[in-house]
């Protein structure tokens, strides 16, 4: 298992909400991807492949979501304070093969002017 | 353990039709890739079609030459893959194997004994 | 449809001696090449997928290597137990065997 910080911009707010972007290299083709708060499970996509190269998705913890082929999004809504937390992008990676687990993450802040329905 | 038993082969004539069962037992069947692979005698092994999982619809796909004449379908329930071959051909005279594939998240390969199929008048 | 090659078609090679089989794909297959070994009147037994990954409890004599379209199969030290028939397969498009490569003992 890897672990590290993201070297990238892990948190986009906006609107009162949050978009977690959890990377993935290009090469990876079926991969389970999981979104911690701490050590909870809060969302988690599976990208599996069939024999004619169909695609399917699966999730067991949904959460608005949006796949691109080297990123999953996971959206929370309605932010307050208690969403400040270490966020974690756990990656499991089916193939290419050998099976192997990332896991990168970040601290998210959260400032006044970023909450869901502030009178301004 | 792991076991993949076909049943079904014999001798039939051309233009006859055979249906062929491979039962599943040791692991997760319903998590796995089925396919059929032939083998004439004394040739080399041929792909013959693959039917999915649950989660890709059970889609089927064949070789050009079996294609229209072979139909793959699996019961999850019973653990249990079909092969029903129609219009036969002496050409199809063959060792038959069921296997089971999987590449999430680890990659598994099992391969059955086989069942022989000839096709002779 | 993806087409393999393989040669030899055959080959005879003494005890302890390094066996190298090559596969050729039609086209760019990546990564997604098996290769099997078949005993008379068994089933194929799969020894290595992935190119180069050994499959569980396959001797380390046993060795893959290659990418795109051209693949290299190795036993590194023959022994008697070797004596079989060895396929090239991709899994990049559905799946296609090699003609097979017999190995057999001076």
């Known amino acids: 298992e890897i672990n590290g910080s993201a070297n990238y911009e892990m948190f986009i707010f906006h609107n009162g909400g949050v978009q977690i972007l959890c990377k993935y290299p290009d090469i990876v083709q079926q991969f389970k991807m999981q979104l911690l708060k701490g050590g909870q499970i809060l969302c988690d996509l599976t990208k599996t492949k069939g024999s004619g190269n169909t695609v399917s998705i699966k999730s067991l913890k949904f959460c608005h979501s949006q796949l691109s082929n080297n990123s999953v999004s996971f959206f929370l809504y309605n932010l307050d304070r208690s969403h400040a937390n270490y966020y974690f992008c756990n990656l499991s990676i089916f193939d290419p093969p050998p099976f192997k687990v990332t896991l990168t993450g970040g601290y998210l802040h959260i400032y006044e002017s970023q909450l869901c329905c502030q009178l301004k | 353990e792991v076991q993949l038993v076909e049943s079904g082969g014999g001798l039939v004539k051309p233009g006859g039709s055979l249906r062929l069962s491979c039962a599943a037992s040791?692991?997760?069947?319903?998590?796995?890739?089925m396919h059929w692979v032939r083998q004439a005698p004394g040739k080399g092994l041929e792909w013959v079609g693959v039917i999915d999982t649950k989660s890709f619809n059970y889609a089927t796909y064949y070789s050009d030459l079996v294609k229209g004449r072979f139909t793959i379908s699996r019961d999850d329930s019973k653990n249990t893959l079909y092969l029903q071959m129609n219009s036969l051909k002496t050409e199809d005279t063959a060792v038959y194997y069921c296997?089971?594939?999987?590449?999430?998240?680890?990659?598994?390969?099992?391969w059955g004994q086989g069942t022989l199929v000839t096709v002779s008048s | 449809d993806i087409q393999m090659t393989q040669s030899p078609s055959s080959l005879s090679a003494s005890v302890g001696d390094r066996v190298t089989i090559t596969c050729q794909a039609s086209?760019?297959?990546?990564?997604?090449l098996s290769w099997y070994q078949q005993k008379p009147g068994k089933a194929p037994k799969l020894l290595i997928y992935?190119?180069?990954l050994l499959a569980e409890g396959v001797p380390s004599r046993f060795s893959g290597s290659g990418s795109g379209t051209d693949f290299t199969f190795t036993i590194s030290s023959l022994q008697p137990e070797d004596i079989a028939t060895y396929y090239c397969?991709?899994?990049?498009?559905?799946?296609?065997f090699g003609p097979g490569t017999k190995v057999d003992i001076k």
């Open positions: 040791g692991f997760t069947f319903s998590d796995y890739f």
């Open positions: 086209q760019d297959i990546s990564n997604y």
């Open positions: 296997t089971a594939t999987i590449a999430v998240p680890y990659y598994f390969d099992y």
């Open positions: 992935y190119t180069n």
């Open positions: 397969q991709q899994y990049y498009n559905y799946r296609t």
